[in-house]
C-alpha cells in the first residue's frame, strides 16, 4: 500500500536519519497546492510555480512541516521570465502559517511581497524574503520573530528589482531579535549600517548597498560576529558588467580605523569593490582570528607593495587581492611587500588582475617561507615573461595558476624560460578583464530560484586535475612551442594544464621530459600535430591525457596522424580526444594495455567506417582494458557490421548518442559480453530489439531517450532480468503491452523513464495504466509528464 497518491506531481523522498519526509514540487507549473501531499511531510518545496495565494487551508493537516520553500511563485517583473510575467503579487491570508507549530524554515523569496508576513509561528528560526518589494523595515513588523535566527532580506531594492525609494530601517528595528545569528541586507540600497544590531549576530551581509561611511560604533556590540561582508559599497566600477555608481569623487568606503575593534571573533571579512586605496593596519589590531580576507576589486596596487596590515593577520588562511590594477598602467613586474612573509597560516593567495609584464623569481621571495601556502593564483595578469623554473621553490604548492596570461616561449634554449620579444618598457595598457566572472559578477553569492543555497563559488582549477596533486595551470596563454628546458626543475608537478594555447608543433616525446611525475596533462584547445607515435611517451606516469579540441591539423587532408601513440603510454587510464574532427588516421589501430576510458566524441567515424572500407573497424580493438567508450556525435547514421567485432573485449559502457542513427544492429551486442550501459539517446531510431535478452545478458542500463520509437516489440523485455535502468522518454510510443513489459523484469528496475511520449489512453491501455498506478518502480515525472495524447477528453491528462 502506497502512502501517497501517484497523482501527486512531486518527488517524494525519505531522509531516514533525519526522520524527514521531503516533498519536492519544484517547477511543476502548479497553480494551486496539489492534493495528496502526505500528512507526515516535513519539508515541502513549491518553488517555481504560479500559485497565486496562501491561506490557512493551504497547509491544512500538514502539521509536521518543518520547512516550506515557497519561492518564486511571483518573481518581480524585471527579475522574472518575460514570457510568463507575474502581475499580481502573492497574497498571504492571515493565519496561513500560525498553526504550523513545528515550522522552522520559511522561504518566501521572489513573490513581490510588500511587507514581512504577519502571523508567523514562534517556532520559526529561518525566514527568507529576498527579491520581494519590502523596502521599509519597522520594529513592529518583526515582533513575532522572537526566535528567528536567520533572516534574509536582500535583493529588495537594487538595479534588477528597483524600488525607486530610499530603503529605510527604523532605529533599533532588529534589536529585539535576541536570537538572531544571520542577517542579510545585501543588494538593497541601504545607506547606513542599521543600529543597533543584536549582539548575537554571527554573520552580517551588507554588500552591494549605498553605504559611504561606517561609523565608529556601528559594530560596537557584535562580539560574536564571524562573517562581515561590506563589499560593493563605494564600488570600483571600471569594466563592471552591471549598472554601477561609485561614491562621490570615486572615494573609498570610509571605515574608521577602530571600527572593527569589537569584532574579536571575526573569521571572514569581505571588502571586495570598496574603492579602497589603503588598508590601515589598525583595522586588524583586534581581529587576530581572521581567516579569510577579500580585498579584490579595489585600488590597492601600491598598497600590495607596502601592506603593513599583513603583520596583524597571523591566522589568515585566504587572501584575495585580485583586480587591484591601476587604470592605464602596465607594470614592469610585481612588487610584493616583505610583509607577506608574516602570513604564516596562509593557504590561498589570489592576485589576479595586478597587470604586469614579467614575473621574476625575486618578486615571489616574500612567499618562499610560507609553509602552509597551497594555492598561488596569478591568473589574468597579462604576464608576458615568466621563467617557470622559479616554482621549484614552491614544491609544496598544490596549485600554481598562471592561466589567462600572455606567456609565450623564448626564442632559444637559454634559461630565460617562457618570455616574449616585446619591448620591456612599461606600456600603457587597458586589459579586457570582463571574462573573469568570479570577480565581475554583481552578486556572486546570489541564489537562483531552483536552489536554496548559494550557487557554487567559482573554482578556476580543473577539479579532476587538481586531485592528482601539484598543478601548474598555463591555460589560455600564448604558448606556441614547448621544449624540455621550459619545464626544468618542475619534476614535482602532477598536473599540467596547457589548454587554450597555440601549440602547433609535432611532439616527438622529448618536450615534457623533466616532468617525470606528471599524471594529468590537459592539452585541449591547441593545434596538436600527431606526426610521431612517440608523442607524450616521455610522460611515464601519465594517467589522464586530454587532447580534445585540437582539430586544426585533423581538418586538413594529407597529414600524418599517428593515433597509435597510446601504446607508449604505459599507465594511461583516460584519454579524451573529443571535438577533433578526426576523419583519417595513418595508424589503423590504437593500442593500450592500460587505457580504461576513451572519449572520442565529435569526430568523424562515419568517414573512417565508410561502407566498403574495413581498414579502421578494429581501431579500438587493441585497447585491451578499455571499459568506457564514448563515440557520440560522430555522424554515424548506421554502424557497419564489423564495428562490434572490432570493439575491445572488456567494454562496459558504450555511448553512441547524438549520431543520427536510423537503425541499430541489436543482435551484434552479443559481441560485447561485458556491456553494462548502452546510450543510444538523441538518435533517430524507430525500433527496439525483438527480445533484448537475446542480444545482451549483461546490459543493466539502456538509454533510448530522444529517438523516434513508436512502439515496443511484443517480447521486448522478456527475460531481461539484469536490466536496472531503462530510459524511453521523449519518443513517440503510443502503447505498451503487458508482454513487452513483463512484471518479473520490471520489478527489478530501479528507474523507468517514460515521460514525453504519445500514449493513447484507450481500452487497450488498461493493463499499462493499471500497472503504472500500482508499480513500486520509480517513474520520474509520472504525474505531470507521462500523459495521453488522446483520445479526445484524455488529451493532456496524466495516464494515472
Amino acid at each position: 500500500a502506497r502512502w501517497f497518491p501517484k497523482t501527486l506531481p512531486c518527488d517524494v523522498t525519505l531522509d531516514v536519519p533525519k526522520n524527514h519526509v521531503i516533498v519536492d514540487c519544484t517547477d511543476k507549473h502548479l497553480t494551486e497546492i496539489p492534493g495528496g501531499i502526505p500528512t507526515n511531510t516535513t519539508n515541502l518545496t513549491l518553488t517555481i510555480n504560479h500559485i497565486p495565494d496562501i491561506s490557512p487551508a493551504s497547509f491544512h493537516r500538514l502539521d509536521h512541516l518543518v520547512e516550506i520553500d515557497f519561492r518564486c511563485n511571483c518573481v518581480p517583473i524585471p527579475l522574472g521570465s518575460k514570457n510568463n510575467m507575474c502581475i499580481k503579487r502573492l497574497q498571504i491570508k492571515p493565519r496561513s502559517f500560525s498553526g504550523l507549530t513545528y515550522l522552522k524554515s520559511l522561504y518566501l523569496d521572489g513573490n513581490q511581497l510588500l511587507e514581512i508576513p504577519q502571523g508567523l509561528p514562534p517556532s520559526l528560526q529561518l525566514l527568507s524574503l529576498e527579491a520581494n518589494n519590502i523596502f521599509s523595515i519597522r520594529k513592529e513588523n518583526l515582533t513575532e520573530l522572537a526566535n528567528i535566527e536567520i533572516l534574509y532580506l536582500g535583493q529588495n531594492c537594487y538595479y534588477r528589482n528597483p524600488c525607486y525609494v530610499s530603503y529605510s530601517i527604523e532605529k533599533d528595528a532588529f534589536l529585539n531579535l535576541t536570537k538572531l545569528k544571520v542577517l542579510s541586507l545585501k543588494d538593497n540600497n541601504v545607506t547606513a549600517v542599521p543600529t543597533v544590531l543584536p549582539s548575537t549576530l554571527t554573520e552580517l551581509y551588507l554588500y552591494n548597498n549605498m553605504i559611504a561611511k561606517i561609523q565608529e560604533d556601528d559594530f560596537n556590540n557584535l562580539n560574536q560576529l564571524q562573517i562581515l561582508d561590506l563589499s560593493g559599497n563605494c564600488p570600483r566600477c571600471y569594466n563592471a558588467p552591471f549598472p554601477c555608481a561609485p561614491c562621490k569623487n570615486n572615494s573609498p568606503l570610509q571605515i574608521p580605523v577602530n571600527a572593527f575593534d569589537a569584532l574579536t571573533e571575526l573569521k571572514v571579512l569581505r571588502l571586495h569593490s570598496n574603492s579602497l586605496q589603503h588598508v590601515p593596519p589598525r583595522w586588524f589590531k583586534n581581529i587576530n582570528k581572521l581567516q579569510e580576507l577579500d580585498l579584490s576589486q579595489n585600488f590597492l596596487a601600491k598598497e600590495i607593495g607596502d601592506a603593513k596590515f599583513l603583520h596583524f593577520l597571523p591566522s589568515l588562511i585566504q587572501l584575495d587581492l585580485s583586480f587591484n590594477f591601476e587604470l592605464q598602467v602596465y607594470r614592469a613586474s610585481m612588487n610584493l611587500s616583505q610583509a607577506f612573509s608574516s602570513l604564516k597560516s596562509l593557504k590561498i593567495l589570489r592576485i589576479r588582475g595586478y597587470v604586469f609584464k614579467e614575473l621574476k623569481s625575486f618578486n615571489l621571495s616574500p612567499l618562499h617561507n610560507l609553509q602552509n601556502l597551497e594555492v598561488l593564483d596569478l591568473g589574468t595578469n597579462f604576464i608576458k615573461i615568466a621563467n617557470l623554473s622559479m616554482f621549484k621553490q614552491f614544491k609544496r604548492l598544490k596549485v600554481i595558476d598562471l592561466s589567462v596570461n600572455k606567456i609565450s616561449p623564448s626564442g632559444d634554449s637559454s634559461e630565460v624560460g617562457f618570455c616574449s620579444n616585446a619591448r620591456t618598457s612599461v606600456e600603457s595598457y587597458e586589459p579586457q578583464v570582463l571574462e573573469q566572472l568570479h570577480y565581475f559578477r554583481y552578486d556572486k553569492y546570489a541564489r537562483s530560484c531552483r536552489f536554496k543555497n548559494k550557487e557554487a563559488s567559482f573554482m578556476s582549477v580543473n577539479e579532476s586535475c587538481y586531485k592528482y596533486g601539484q598543478t601548474l595551470d598555463l591555460s589560455k596563454n600564448s604558448i606556441f612551442f614547448v621544449k624540455s628546458s621550459d619545464f626544468q626543475h618542475l619534476s614535482f608537478l602532477k598536473c599540467l594544464n596547457l589548454s587554450g594555447n597555440l601549440i602547433s608543433q609535432t611532439l616527438n616525446g622529448s618536450e615534457f621530459q623533466p616532468l617525470a611525475e606528471l599524471r594529468y596533462l590537459d592539452f585541449s584547445n591547441n593545434r596538436l600535430d600527431l606526426l610521431h607515435s612517440t608523442a607524450f611517451e616521455e610522460l611515464h606516469k601519465l594517467e589522464v591525457l586530454d587532447i580534445s579540441s585540437n582539430s586544426h591539423y585533423f581538418q586538413s587532408e594529407g597529414i600524418t596522424h599517428m593515433l597509435n601513440f597510446t601504446k607508449n603510454l604505459k599507465v594511461l587510464q583516460k584519454l579524451m580526444m573529443n571535438d577533433n574532427d578526426i576523419s583519417s588516421s595513418t595508424s589503423r589501430t590504437m593500442e593500450s594495455e592500460s587505457l580504461r576510458t576513451l572519449e572520442f566524441r565529435g569526430n568523424h567515424l562515419d568517414v573512417l567506417w565508410r561502407e566498403g572500407d574495413n581498414r579502421y573497424l578494429q581501431l579500438f580493438k587493441n585497447l585491451l582494458k578499455l571499459e568506457e567508450l564514448d563515440i557520440s556525435k560522430n555522424s554515424l547514421s548506421f554502424l557497419p557490421s564489423g564495428v562490434f567485432d572490432g570493439m575491445p573485449p572488456n567494454l562496459k559502457n558504450l555511448s553512441l548518442a547524438k549520431n543520427g542513427l536510423k537503425s541499430f544492429s541489436w543482435k551484434k551486442l552479443q559481441c560485447l559480453k561485458n556491456l553494462e550501459t548502452l546510450d543510444l539517446s538523441h538518435n533517430q531510431l524507430t525500433t527496439v530489439p525483438e527480445r533484448l535478452s537475446n542480444c545482451s545478458r549483461s546490459l543493466k542500463n539502456l538509454i533510448l531517450k530522444n529517438n523516434q520509437i513508436r512502439s515496443l516489440t511484443k517480447y521486448f523485455l522478456q527475460d531481461a532480468f539484469q536490466l536496472r535502468y531503462l530510459d524511453l522518454s521523449s519518443n513517440k510510443i503510443q502503447m505498451i503491452q503487458k508482454t513487452s513489459f513483463p512484471e518479473n523484469v520490471l520489478n527489478n528496475l530501479k528507474m523507468l523513464l517514460l515521460h514525453h511520449n504519445r500514449f493513447l489512453c484507450t481500452c487497450d491501455a488498461v493493463w499499462f495504466v493499471w500497472w503504472v498506478n500500482h508499480t513500486e518502480v520509480t517513474i520520474p515525472y509520472l504525474a505531470t509528464d507521462v500523459t495521453c495524447v488522446g483520445p479526445g477528453a484524455h488529451k493532456g491528462q496524466s495516464v494515472i
Partner: antibody, heavy 116, light 106 residues
C-alpha cells in the same frame, strides 16, 4: 561626557612596586583600547602599552615588557598599570588615554616619584 | 617602525601671529596623523585627527594639512591660551609621537 580619572601623585621607595589606576566613565569601557603613556621631566611622550578591556588583550612597548603589567577591572571600569622594581628612572608622569586609532581622551596624569 | 621627526623643537612667537609646526614621517602614513596640545599639570588635548579633521570644540584657528610623509600644523591669530607644547602622533602603523614643539612668547 568621557572622563579618565587618575590620582594626582604617588610616592614610592626604590625596589618597590606601584599600581596606578585610571577610572573611566561616560563611555562603554569594554569596547575601547586603553593606553598608558610616560612623560619624564623635560622629555617627550613615550608609549608604554595598551589593553582591550573586553578580553584583557595587551600589547607592550618592548622596553616596558618587564617593567609594566596592564590589567582591568570591568566591574568598576578601571584600568591598572603595575610598575615593578622601581628606580629613579621610573619617576615620571604617567597618563592613561582612550584610543580610537588616535588618543581622543587623556587622564590628567599621575606623578610618580621614586625616592627613599 | 615609523619615526616622526617634529620641527622645530621650540618656537618663540608673538600674540596674534601665525605659527607652523611640521612632522616628517619615515614613510607614507596615509594621512593618519593627529595633533595634541599639552599644558603642564594636564593631560594632552586632541586638536586634529586624520591630518585636518578638527575635534569638536576646537577653534578654527587651528588647522592641519599634508599627505604622504610630510605634514604641518598651524595656529593663526595666536592667543595667550595657546602657549603649550604640541605633539604629532602617527597612527597608520602602530603609534609614534613626535618629540614635541614648545611654544613660547617672545
Amino acid at each position: 561626557q568621557v572622563q579618565l580619572q587618575q590620582p594626582g601623585a604617588e610616592l614610592v621607595k626604590p625596589g618597590a612596586s606601584v599600581n596606578l589606576s585610571c577610572k573611566a566613565s561616560g563611555y562603554t569601557f569594554t569596547n575601547n583600547w586603553l593606553h598608558w603613556v610616560k612623560q619624564r621631566p623635560g622629555r617627550g611622550l613615550e608609549w608604554i602599552g595598551d589593553i582591550y578591556p573586553s578580553n584583557g588583550r595587551t600589547n607592550y612597548n618592548e622596553q616596558f615588557k618587564t617593567k609594566a603589567t596592564l590589567t582591568v577591572d570591568k566591574s568598576s571600569s578601571t584600568a591598572y598599570m603595575q610598575l615593578s622594581s622601581l628606580t629613579s628612572e621610573d619617576s615620571a608622569v604617567y597618563f592613561c588615554a582612550r584610543e580610537r586609532g588616535y588618543f581622543d581622551y587623556w587622564g590628567q596624569g599621575t606623578a610618580l616619584t621614586v625616592s627613599s | 617602525d615609523i619615526q616622526m621627526t617634529q620641527s622645530p623643537s621650540s618656537l618663540s612667537t608673538s600674540l596674534g601671529g601665525k605659527v607652523t609646526i611640521t612632522c616628517k614621517a619615515s614613510q607614507d602614513i596615509n594621512k593618519y596623523i593627529a595633533w595634541y596640545q599639552h599644558k603642564p599639570g594636564k593631560g594632552p588635548r586632541l586638536l586634529i585627527h586624520y591630518t585636518s579633521t578638527l575635534q569638536p570644540g576646537i577653534p578654527s584657528r587651528f588647522s592641519g594639512s599634508g599627505s604622504g610623509r610630510d605634514y604641518s600644523f598651524s595656529i593663526s591669530n595666536l592667543e595667550p591660551e595657546d602657549i603649550a607644547t604640541y605633539y604629532c602622533l602617527q597612527y597608520d602603523y602602530l603609534l609614534t609621537f613626535g618629540a614635541g614643539t614648545k611654544l613660547e612668547l617672545k
